[in-house]
């Protein structure tokens, strides 16, 4: 029987800068029942606080509700593991809510094949920002990424859409059924999960000649460049 091993706070995430949750990994339990508590203070404070909510985020978590979440404040937190033989503490973690935002996926993904008579056919993709994000305040800039692939293909095509909430894609395989998904990230923060897939059947007559493929981006009203994983590196927050 031993004191508990050192716990580790491994992740903090906020869906919208208004609330956030942190999770820790317990160390070894030393063969005894172990209690965990998270304490924190804010930068510029020495007043120590205890986690206000150990329930909402699930096991080994601390949830900070609206009234506990301050923008522009760095939280300095640690986890204490205690059993009958003694205690151990995690390293301190510094958390700025601005940099831990991971939004919910975008909503209302709609995909449509457009075949105007006078113009080239294209796939039109439209979505809405996640509901928890209030873009009107100006606190947020959300960036979007689309991925799509034929149903049976292994590789995804990834398109970076910037701040737009709609996008047009030209080069598709006629007659194929495509899966389309979209995700978002704030300017500082983490990519959301991908939205649920939307399926779209591309008609067999969805064709264009080479001349039609060379269309300006302005003409399309959306960015068309197919971005490689390397190109995308600077859009991702690792």
């Amino acid at each position: 029987q031993l004191p508990p091993g050192k716990p580790e706070i491994f992740k903090c995430r906020s869906p919208n800068k208004e609330t956030f949750t942190c999770w820790w990994r317990p160390g070894t339990d030393g063969g005894l029942p172990t209690n965990y508590s998270l304490t924190y203070h804010r930068e510029g404070e020495t007043l120590m606080h205890e986690c206000p909510d150990y329930i909402t985020g699930g096991p080994n978590s601390c949830h900070f509700g609206k009234q506990y979440t301050s923008m522009w404040r760095t939280y300095i937190m640690m986890v204490n593991a205690t059993n009958q033989m003694g205690s151990s503490f995690s390293d301190e973690l510094y958390v700025d809510v601005t940099y831990i935002v991971q939004p919910d996926p975008p909503l209302e993904l709609a995909v449509e094949v457009k075949q105007p008579e006078d113009r080239k056919p294209y796939l039109w993709i439209k979505w809405s920002p996640p509901t928890l994000i209030d873009l009107k305040t100006g606190w947020f800039t959300l960036l979007y990424e689309i991925r799509l692939k034929p149903e049976k293909a292994a590789e995804w095509e990834i398109h970076f859409a910037g701040q737009q909430t709609e996008f047009k894609i030209l080069s598709l395989h006629p007659g194929q059924k495509y899966l389309v998904q979209v995700r978002c990230k704030p300017d500082h923060g983490y990519w959301s999960a991908w939205s649920p897939a939307t399926f779209i059947q591309i008609p067999s007559d969805f064709t264009m000649n080479d001349e039609q493929k060379l269309i300006s981006e302005e003409d399309l009203g959306g960015e068309q460049k197919l971005i490689s994983e390397e190109d995308l590196h600077h859009h991702h927050h690792h």
């Epitope: 404070e45 020495t46 120590m48 606080h49 909510d53 979440t69």
Partner: antibody
């Protein structure tokens, strides 16, 4: 309705003891840090004690250290102040106050009067 | 311990006047400062926190300013219902010290 109601005040002789209670309702008491603040007749506000949500962190003002004990019972939604070795200068209205998430006293009780006199 | 000094200790002004109360911390406290209003015979009420953030429901004639060691509470146009004692309080560390208070009266 969010409410704090103090009780337990009264007249006590110097050197005596008293236990103040604060009953909370209308909010999740166990998620909030709580405090006692007092106000002597005609004087200003004096913070005297703080307790964290699960009771693991406690602070006292120097004026009461070693004589008063703050504790809480989250199952009963109650905060307590055990006051021993009371002095005349402890005569005051005692308020319990909820500390909001940004560390300010957002909810106050109506107060309970403690008079220490022989 | 950090001391909080308020001035003036009392003031008398006319309805509609602009009133400013100052609070000085003996050491820097960033903007961890709150202002409370206590009307005669009543419980204290939070007005402002983080030095300048107005608590919801508080009239916009109240405003706060300052950072570090020097802070102000301003009532832009004094109303009869503003007769009260005003307290500043620091909350960055224990003890959570209050200032001595400023009593505001109507001339």
């Amino acid at each position: 309705e969010v409410q704090l109601v103090e009780s337990g005040g009264g007249l006590v002789q110097p050197g005596g003891s008293l236990r103040l209670s604060c009953a909370a309702s209308g909010f999740t008491f166990s998620s909030y840090e709580m405090n006692w603040v007092r106000q002597a007749p005609g004087k200003g506000l004096e913070w005297i004690s703080y307790i964290s949500s699960r009771g693991g962190t406690i602070y006292y003002a120097d004026s009461i250290k070693g004589r008063f004990t703050i504790y809480r019972d989250n199952a009963r939604n109650s905060l307590y102040l055990q006051m021993n070795s009371l002095r005349a200068e402890d005569t005051a209205i005692y308020y319990c106050a909820r500390l909001s998430g940004v560390d300010i006293f957002d909810i106050w009780g109506q107060g309970t009067m403690v008079t220490v006199s022989s | 311990d950090i001391q909080m000094t308020q001035s003036p200790s009392s003031l008398s002004a006319s309805v509609g006047d602009r009133v400013t109360i100052t609070c000085r911390a003996s050491q820097g406290i960033s903007n961890y400062l709150a202002w409370y209003q206590q009307k005669p015979g009543k419980v204290p009420k939070l007005l402002i926190y983080f030095a300048s953030t107005l608590q919801s429901g508080v009239p916009s004639r109240f405003s706060g300013g300052g950072s570090g060691t020097d802070f102000t509470l301003t009532i832009s146009s004094l109303q009869p219902e503003d007769v009260a004692t005003y307290y500043c309080q620091r909350y960055n560390s224990a003890p959570l010290t209050f200032g001595g208070g400023t009593k505001v009266e109507i001339k």
